[in-house]
């Protein structure tokens, strides 16, 4: 199954495998300062780290990819660490009539897996 | 938006950016020969290639990731090429009572994007 050992034990050492990490970013960093008003700084959770064999496999495809990468590393890439789910965020932004609130469902990662 | 230029034009040259590629794999390659009977060989579509800035961005998060990677390449990884959808596959496999068919929804990639 996609959740087989060694799904959650990182063989590379602490903090090296696919995990969620917080990155501070300003609206200027994101190029959003002309239309987003607030918050001025976002705590963006992102997926970082390596995906050793079968670690946090997203699904059957990711397991196959990991196996074939072992057999044909030049042809098949290793799985990589990407979001498995997202946390909605509400932003205050400029509109023609003033300021409004809008939710973004796909902005901040909530969980990560290897796909 | 996630679909802004240069979403689909690869700046790295033909075949270098994130795309679907067919990889031939036998049941032995996959370690499935003891329980899958047929097909003996699978044409596995996989996602390969690089994800230059904004190319085939999966969503807002991927766009942000691309931008922050440009600003902090040591801290934020570039987006990577992963399946956006899958093609179901039917396999014939052994059971205690003989042989049965089973569909796998997450085995073969159908489309790719940068996440």
């Amino acid at each position: 199954s996609a959740h087989a050992h060694p799904r959650d034990s990182c063989p590379l050492g602490p903090g090296r495998c696919c995990h969620l990490e917080t990155v501070q970013a300003t609206l200027e960093d994101l190029g959003w300062s002309d239309w987003v008003l607030s918050p001025r700084q976002l705590q963006l959770s992102m997926c970082v780290g390596e995906c050793p064999h079968l670690y946090r496999s997203a699904n059957t495809h990711a397991q196959i990819k990991a196996r074939l990468h072992g057999l044909q590393p030049d042809k098949v890439p290793a799985p990589c660490c990407v979001p498995s789910s997202y946390t909605p965020v509400v932003l205050m932004h400029r509109t023609d009539s003033g300021v409004s609130l809008q939710t973004y469902d796909d902005l901040v990662a909530r969980g990560c897996h290897c796909a | 938006s996630a679909h802004a230029h240069p979403r689909d034009s690869c700046p790295l040259g033909p075949g270098r950016c994130c795309h679907l590629e067919t990889v031939q794999a036998t049941l032995e390659d996959l370690g499935w020969s003891d329980w899958v009977l047929s097909p003996r060989q699978l044409q596995l579509s996989m996602c390969v290639g690089e994800c230059p800035h904004l190319y085939r961005s999966a969503n807002t998060h991927a766009q942000i990731k691309a931008r922050l990677h440009g600003l902090q390449p040591d801290k934020v990884p570039a987006p990577c090429c992963v399946p956006s959808s899958y093609t179901p596959v039917v396999l014939m496999h052994r059971t205690d009572s003989g042989v049965s068919l089973q569909t796998y929804d997450d085995l073969v990639a159908r489309g790719c994007h940068c996440a």
């Epitope: 008003l37 001025r40 965020v89 509400v90 | -």
Partner: antibody, heavy 119, light 110 residues
């Protein structure tokens, strides 16, 4: 420790003005939005509006637009809710609440300010 | 009339399990997380569950939240007398921003 401390109960007459306050402490006041929530006697919670104390941007619920004014003074870490002309129907408990990191929920609440409007 | 619909009251005996439902639509619960607040008699509301199923520190694991489609529910197991309170669900609606359910009064019997 994060705390939101609101001003005391008020008894007013219809037509009078009023400004109630909510002082934040134990966190960076300008880094989190503050919302105001009304609870009429024996009723449920109603969201009134939100302010970003850092930029003083405000957004109101359509039901409260034009009825109240939300403001903040970041130098004293205080948010305000005010009325220019009270009505008997404004009688309620008013809560200030701090928004969580991503602006989708209220993680800390003030103790509430009871406003009674009666002739 | 609240945008999110909750039953006005639920009850249960000590030790029992009770659930409180919160029904919305595709413009609120369907697209955003649900949060739950507990309001003990005479006090301010307190965050109980955020982002569908997360408990803030200090909230006992007897409280749990879940969401499916356009509905959410709060479950309380091992009911205790001190759980007697009003419970509110809250989400975000594209037309009116932050919305609350009408509230559910939980009575602990006996």
């Amino acid at each position: 420790e994060v705390q939101l401390v609101q001003s005391g109960a008020e008894v007013k007459k219809p037509g009078e003005s009023l400004k109630i306050s909510c002082k934040g402490s134990g966190y960076s006041f300008t880094s989190y939005w503050i919302g105001w929530v009304r609870q009429m006697p024996g009723k449920g919670l109603e969201w009134m509006g939100v302010i970003d104390p850092g930029g003083s941007y405000t957004i109101y619920s359509p039901s409260f637009q034009g009825q109240v004014t939300i403001s903040a003074d970041k130098s004293i870490s205080t948010a305000y809710l005010q009325w220019s002309s009270l009505k008997a129907s404004d009688t309620a408990m008013y809560y200030c609440a701090r928004y969580g990191r991503y602006g989708t929920y209220f993680d800390y609440w003030g103790q509430g300010t009871l406003v009674t409007v009666s002739s | 009339q609240s945008v999110l619909t909750q039953p006005p009251s639920v009850s249960g005996a000590p030790g029992q399990r009770v659930t409180i439902s919160c029904s919305g639509s595709s413009s609120n619960i369907g697209v955003l997380y649900v949060n739950w607040y507990q309001q003990l008699p005479g006090t301010a509301p307190k965050l109980l569950i955020y982002s569908n199923d997360n408990r803030p520190s200090g909230v006992p694991d007897r409280f749990s939240g879940s969401k499916s489609g356009t509905s959410a529910s709060l479950a309380i197991t091992g009911l205790q007398a001190e759980d007697e309170a009003d419970y509110y669900c809250q989400s975000w609606d594209s037309s009116s921003n932050y919305v609350f359910g009408g509230g559910t009064k939980l009575t602990v019997l006996g």
